[in-house]
C-alpha cells in the first residue's frame, strides 16, 4: 500500500527502479550475503532435447524445425547427431546427475521422436522406451523429474502442413501431444512445463529469423505466434486440471523468459516508463495473460493494436491464473541478441534480484521456480570455467537475497546446463554444460567442470557458508 | 597413466578389525565414485557399495551394513574400505574399482586386490 | 534387490569356436549391464558396458546384446587368452549385482 501511495506506481514493476531507499524493495547494501537457501530448497539442473540428445534420425524419429533449419540455415554446423547423444548415452547422464546431487532434473521430451509427423496416432516405441527409462532412473535415484513438452523442437511436418505456431490448428494438436504424456509419464512426474521461452519461439522464429522455422520481418505473425502458444499452454493446463491433476496430484506452468534492464538516468520518469516497457514487452506479453488479468498488458494493446491479437472476454477468462507456479529464465538466450525495439534505449543489467522483484510486485508475489539460469563460456574452456562459477555465484546471491531480504517465494533453481550441447543460433561455438563433452569423441564422456564441483558444493551446503 | 593401487594382504583373528586403502593416480577419485567388490576364495564377485569422495556419501548392499564402511581422504587421493568383527567368513580378496565419472557406473579401472585372511 | 543369473557354470569350446554366455536379471534392468573378465589371480576386467558397447581396447570378437531382462556376451572365435570366468552385472539400481559368473574352459 505504501509503494503505490508513495510511488504513484499503482503498485507495478516500476517501483523497482525508484532509488529512494525509503521505497525500493531492492536494497543495494546488501551485496553478498552468506547464508543458507530454505529447508527444503529444490536444487535442480536443465537441458532441452534438441540440444543433447543427438540421434536425430535414429530409431524413427521425425525431423524438427530445428533439424531442417540446421542444415538450411546454419552452413558451418553438420547437424545435431553428434551433440552430446544423450539418447544413446543416457546413462552417463544419470551418472552425472547422481554425482552432482541434484533434487531435479529438468529435461525437454522430443515431440518427433514420440510422434515423427507431430500427430498423435501410434507412438514410436523406441521414443517412448527412452523416455520412459530416463524416467525410471530418475524416480530409482529419487531425482524429481520437471518435464518440458515443447523446448522448441517441433515436428517439421506441422510447420509444412500447418504453417507451424501461426495456424490456431496446432493449439489442438499440441493438447493431444500433452494428454498422451500425461497418460504415459503423469505416474512419475509430478512437474510439467508446457512451452519453454514462447517470447524467443515467436521473436526470433518469426521476427529476426534467427531460430527456426527462420521466418522474419513480419509482426503480425510473430504476435500470432505468441497468441497461439499462449492459448496451447492454457488448453494443457485446463486440460490437466480437469483429468490429471485429481489422480496425478502434479503442477503445470509454462517457462517464461526474461532479460532486466535499468533506466539511463535513475530519476527520469521517462527513462523508468521505458524500462517498464521493456520488461512488458518481453515478460509482460506472455504473463499477463496467464499470470496477471487474462490479457496482453495495456501498454502493448494501445501500441500494437494492428498487430496484436484480441482475447475475447471469455478467452480472458480462460487463460488468468493457468500456472501454478511462476517458472522464469533468466541467462544468455534473453540477453544475447536482444530485441532492440525491447531494449528502448535502456541500459540492460544481469540483475535477477530485481528481475524477480518485478515479478513479486506485477504479479502478486508468486511461487517462482527459477527454471534456467547460467551463463556461457567460448567453446575453447574446457573443464576450467572459471566465468562460469563467477555468474553462478552472483545469480545464486541474487536469488539468496531475493529470498531472504525481499521475500521471493522462490522454491527452486535450474542450473543451466547439464551439458555442454547445441546452443541454438550459436551453435557449438558457446558451452554451457556443467559437465564437458568433447563432441569430437566416440565415447563423449561427460568431465564435471569446476562449475560442476562447485554446484555441487552449493547443494551440499544449501547455499554459501562463512 | 590411471592406477588405483591397494594396500597389502592381511592376517588378522577373528574379532578384529581392519582398514584398506586404495589410492588412486592418474585421477582426482574427487571426480568419480569409488566402488569396493568382494570375492571369496573360488566365489564369484559381490559389490558391497560405494563413495564419492568429494562429499562422503555412501551407498552400501545391506548385507554389508554394519559390516563394512567406506571413506575416503580427497587430500591424499585415497579410498578406505573398514571391516569390523571380522570372521572367517570375511576371508576374502577386496577390490576398489572406479571409473571416469562420465562414462556411467561400469567399472573399467581396478585395484590389484587386497586379500585378507581371517584365521585363528 | 535384482538377481543375477549366469545359468551355465561352466562352458567347455573348442578353439576359434562361438561361446554364448547368457545372463537373466530378475527385473527389467533397460541394458544398464557390464560384463566382465576375470582371469586367475587377477582383477577382472570391463569389456563391455550398455549391454552392448564395446569398451577401448577390447578385440571386436567379444560382443554384447538383449534387452528388458535377457543378455547375451557373445565371443565368436574363441582364443587362447579368452579361458577366463565371465561376470555379468546390472547397474540399473543399487545394491549392483553380479551374476555367478561362467567359466570358460578349452574343450
Known amino acids: 500500500i505504501l509503494l503505490r501511495a508513495v510511488t504513484g506506481f499503482s503498485g507495478d514493476g516500476r517501483a523497482i527502479w525508484s532509488k529512494n531507499p525509503n521505497f525500493t524493495p531492492v536494497n543495494e547494501s546488501q551485496l553478498f550475503l552468506y547464508d543458507t537457501f530454505p529447508k527444503n530448497f529444490f536444487w535442480g539442473i536443465g537441458t532441452g532435447a534438441l540440444q543433447v540428445e543427438g540421434s536425430w534420425k535414429k530409431d524413427g524419429k521425425g525431423p524438427s524445425i530445428w533439424d531442417h533449419f540446421i542444415h538450411t540455415h546454419l552452413k558451418n554446423v553438420s547437424s545435431t547427431n553428434g551433440s552430446s547423444d544423450s539418447y544413446i548415452f543416457l546413462e552417463k547422464d544419470l551418472s552425472a546427475l547422481d554425482f552432482i546431487g541434484v533434487s531435479f532434473y529438468q529435461f525437454s521430451i522430443s515431440w518427433p521422436r514420440l510422434f515423427p509427423d507431430g500427430i498423435v496416432t501410434v507412438a514410436n516405441a523406441k521414443g517412448l522406451q527412452y523416455y520412459s527409462t530416463l524416467l525410471d532412473a530418475l524416480v530409482l535415484r529419487n531425482i524429481e523429474p520437471i518435464v518440458t513438452l515443447y523446448h522448441w523442437d517441433l515436428p517439421l511436418a506441422l510447420q509444412e502442413k500447418y504453417g507451424g505456431w501461426k495456424n490456431d490448428t496446432i493449439i489442438d494438436i499440441f493438447n493431444d501431444y500433452a494428454t498422451y504424456c500425461f497418460q504415459m509419464f503423469g505416474d512419475r512426474v509430478k512437474y510439467w512445463i508446457t512451452i519453454h521461452n514462447p517470447y524467443l519461439v515467436a521473436w526470433h522464429g518469426y521476427g529476426t529469423g534467427m531460430h527456426a522455422p527462420g521466418e522474419k520481418g513480419n509482426l503480425a505473425a510473430v504476435y500470432t505466434v505468441g497468441h497461439n502458444l499462449i492459448k496451447a499452454h492454457s488448453k494443457v493446463w485446463h486440460n490437466y486440471n480437469t483429468h490429471f491433476r485429481p489422480h496425478q496430484k502434479g503442477w503445470l506452468s509454462i517457462t517464461l523468459g526474461s532479460h532486466w534492464i535499468e533506466p539511463n538516468r535513475s530519476e527520469n520518469t521517462m527513462d523508468i516508463f521505458k524500462c517498464q516497457q521493456s520488461m512488458v514487452s518481453v515478460l509482460g506479453w506472455f504473463a499477463n495473460p496467464i499470470h496477471g488479468d487474462g490479457d496482453y498488458p495495456e501498454g502493448m494493446r494501445k501500441k500494437l493494436f494492428s498487430v496484436l491479437p484480441i482475447f475475447s472476454e471469455a478467452e480472458k477468462h480462460e487463460m488468468r491464473g493457468t500456472a501454478d507456479f511462476f517458472a522464469f529464465s533468466f541467462g544468455p538466450n534473453n540477453f544475447k541478441p536482444l530485441n532492440t525495439m525491447a531494449k528502448m534505449g535502456q541500459n540492460v543489467s544481469l540483475n535477477l534480484r530485481e528481475a524477480l522483484n518485478w515479478i513479486k510486485l506485477e504479479y502478486n508475489n508468486p511461487r517462482i521456480l527459477i527454471a534456467e539460469n547460467g551463463w556461457f563460456t567460448d567453446s575453447r574452456v574446457k573443464t576450467e570455467d572459471t566465468t562460469a562459477i563467477y555468474m553462478m555465484k552472483n545469480f545464486l546471491s541474487q536469488v539468496l537475497q531475493a529470498i531472504r531480504l525481499d521475500e521471493i517465494r522462490v522454491f527452486g533453481y535450474t542450473a543451466w546446463s547439464l551439458l555442454d550441447g547445441f546452443e541454438w543460433q550459436d551453435a557449438y561455438t558457446i558451452r554451457r554444460g556443467l559437465f564437458y563433452v568433447d563432441f569430437n569423441s566416440k565415447q563423449k564422456e561427460r568431465k564435471p567442470k569446476s562449475s560442476a564441483h562447485y554446484y555441487k558444493q552449493i547443494i551440499r551446503e544449501n547455499g554459501f557458508s562463512l | 597413466e590411471v592406477q588405483l593401487q591397494q594396500s597389502g594382504a592381511e592376517l588378522l583373528k577373528p574379532g578384529a578389525s581392519v582398514r584398506l586403502s586404495c589410492t588412486a593416480s592418474?585421477?582426482?577419485?574427487?571426480?568419480?565414485?569409488t566402488h569396493w567388490v568382494r570375492q571369496r576364495p573360488e566365489q564369484g564377485l559381490e559389490w558391497i557399495g560405494r563413495?564419492?569422495?568429494?562429499?562422503?556419501?555412501?551407498k552400501y548392499d545391506p548385507k554389508f551394513q554394519g559390516k563394512a564402511k567406506i571413506l575416503a581422504d580427497t587430500s591424499s587421493n585415497t579410498a578406505y574400505l573398514q571391516l569390523i568383527g571380522l570372521t572367517s567368513e570375511d576371508t576374502a580378496v577386496y577390490y576398489c574399482a572406479s571409473r571416469a565419472l562420465g562414462n556411467g557406473y561400469a567399472m573399467d579401472y581396478w585395484g590389484q586386490g587386497t586379500s585378507v585372511t581371517v584365521s585363528s | 534387490d535384482i538377481q543375477m543369473t549366469q545359468s551355465s557354470s561352466y562352458l567347455s569350446v573348442s578353439l576359434g569356436g562361438r561361446v554364448t554366455i547368457t545372463c537373466k536379471a530378475s527385473?527389467?534392468?533397460?541394458?544398464?549391464l557390464a560384463w566382465y573378465q576375470q582371469k586367475p589371480g587377477n582383477a577382472p576386467r570391463l569389456l563391455i558396458s550398455g549391454a552392448s558397447n564395446l569398451e577401448t581396447g577390447i578385440p571386436s570378437r567379444f560382443s554384447g546384446s538383449g534387452s528388458g531382462k535377457d543378455y547375451t556376451l557373445t565371443i565368436t572365435s574363441l582364443q587362447t587368452e579368452d579361458v577366463a570366468t565371465y561376470y555379468c552385472?546390472?547397474?540399473?539400481?543399487?545394491?549392483?549385482?553380479f551374476g555367478s559368473g561362467t567359466k570358460l574352459e578349452i574343450k
Open positions: 592418474g585421477f582426482n577419485i574427487q571426480d568419480t565414485f
Open positions: 552385472q546390472q547397474y540399473w539400481n543399487t545394491p549392483f549385482t
Open positions: 563413495i564419492d569422495p568429494s562429499n562422503g556419501n555412501t
Open positions: 527385473d527389467h534392468i533397460n541394458n544398464w
